[in-house]
Amino acid sequence: EVEKTACPSGKKAREIDESLIFYKKWELEACVDAALLATQMDRVNAIPFTYEQLDVLKHKLDELYPQGYPESVIQHLGYLFLKMSPEDIRKWNVTSLETLKALLEVNKGHEMSPQVATLIDRFVKGRGQLDKDTLDTLTAFYPGYLCSLSPEELSSVPPSSIWAVRPQDLDTCDPRQLDVLYPKARLAFQNMNGSEYFVKIQSFLGGAPTEDLKALSQQNVSMDLATFMKLRTDAVLPLTVAEVQKLLGPHVEGLKAEERHRPVRDWILRQRQDDLDTLGLGLQGGIPNGYLVLDLSMQEALS
């Protein structure tokens, strides 16, 4: 805590300007009026204050706003944002997307810090949902943002926001997250025609059920192997050889290179070898001719 000392004669700050960088910490404390600082926060960023000096400025704002800073101040914090703790940020009420962008810009190029995570959490909770503009902004700064959310948090994403999602934003999502996002994407894109729909829905298909894959197989979509390999194994297993052939189109030849990996490996084990042979790819491991297939899971459900 900086000692309370009187401001030396002639040193009282009339405005926030570069002359303040020559002030000692105690002089900043004594000579800079907190209300002046609050109204001229936009100037702080342009002045090369030391970290110690920034600590003093933060202290002055904390004294002026013990319940949390107003948004007019928050929007212009600039590098002073890096001095804030998650506890400080929890006191804020950030409603403007411009404020959010300004603070994310300060942290740009770095990993998501606890401060940024808290800021985003406060902002999204304040809005009540992850709307399209917010999602656009967050994924622009942090492409992995969407996949860092829990399925519960993702449930607040309205289908209209899905338009803001780019394929790379889903790269690190696991099946539980895609289970939540896929139905929203399905709803969001349902007015598009077949080929356009597939282009948009493709990245979300790791959350699709079997029947949707069957429907897509009737659409001449030519799914690539990378997408196929990300499908839920249990959604792929019930597909017939003919359906997989239709789903993949010319990419069906890629199954050979993936025959030892899930879901291809598990799917092969469920198919009749005769049916696999019709693909002419030399896939091995199917059910031999003459064997009876019992679906025990269905048997259980029916008993």
Epitope: P151, Y197, P209, T210, E211, Q219, M298
Partner: antibody, heavy 122, light 107 residues
Framework: QVQLQESGPGLVKPSETLSLTCTVS????????WSWVRQPPGKGLEWIGY???????NANPSLKSRVIISVDTSKNQFSLKLSSVTAADTAVYYC????????????????WGRGTLVTVSS | EIVMTQSPATLSVSPGERATLSCRAS??????LAWYQQKPGQAPRLLIY???TRATGIPARFSGSGSGTEFTLTISSLQSEDFAVYYC?????????FGQGTRLEIK
């Protein structure tokens, strides 16, 4: 062919929790999305929410705070719990299958259970 | 939420005649509209989806039209088994919502 059958108590006391189960027979619960829809006597239909076999759900905002939808894939069943019920929750409750193969997308219902009447009364 | 309004509440038509039922959405639902038929003591039955596509096994006398906010279900020549309550449902956005129903009765 696939059939749906609702089961559960026909009478629930006010402020208690309504619990219903839908059993899917003749097909796997894993292939589709499954919904609950209700219909108060002499009134229209109201969508309650859906579940995917992985447990992912979505509920009508008007009921969300009181609704829990869950799934038991080993039994090919999904369930509805509606808490703090009042007389306004008296209705026929239907389980329904969200349409599959006939359309690439579309949240409407091509298969319904017969429905079960639940009366909320002390 | 999107509010679906059906009219008329009750429609009286003679067998063999044409019946026209209307459904209006409070905002555009594109063509994401389904029609159902419900008879007393039974579950609803899907008739039409995509505003105009007949579901499997639905007779050709049932037809749907419209897009945006105005939709129509037409039954060209009423059979005795067609007298029931008809509901429209939008699936353009969550929550999924239904109209309050039109009761089609014998005149």
């Amino acid at each position: 062919q696939v059939q749906l059958q609702e089961s559960g108590p026909g009478l629930v006391k006010p402020s208690e929790t309504l619990s219903l189960t839908c059993t899917v027979s003749g097909g796997s619960i894993q292939n589709y999305y499954w919904s609950w829809v209700r219909q108060p006597p002499g009134k229209g239909l109201e969508w309650i929410g859906y579940i995917f076999y992985s447990g992912s759900t979505n509920a009508n905002p008007s009921l969300k705070s009181r609704v829990i939808i869950s799934v038991d894939t080993s039994k090919n069943q999904f369930s509805l719990k509606l808490s703090s019920v009042t007389a306004a929750d008296t209705a026929v409750y239907y389980c329904a299958r969200e349409v599959g193969r006939i359309a690439v997308a579309g949240w409407f219902f091509d298969l319904w259970g017969r429905g079960t009447l639940v009366t909320v009364s002390s | 939420e999107i509010v679906m309004t059906q009219s008329p509440a009750t429609l009286s038509v003679s067998p063999g005649e044409r019946a026209t039922l209307s459904c209006r959405a409070s905002q555009s639902v594109n063509s994401n509209l389904a029609w159902y038929q419900q008879k007393p003591g039974q579950a609803p039955r899907l008739l039409i989806y995509g505003a105009s596509t007949r579901a499997t096994g639905i007779p050709a006398r049932f037809s749907g039209s419209g897009s945006g906010t105005e939709f129509t279900l037409t039954i060209s020549s009423l059979q005795s088994e067609d007298f029931a309550v008809y509901y429209c449902q939008q699936y353009n956005n969550w929550p999924l919502t239904f109209g309050q129903g039109t009761r089609l009765e014998i005149k």
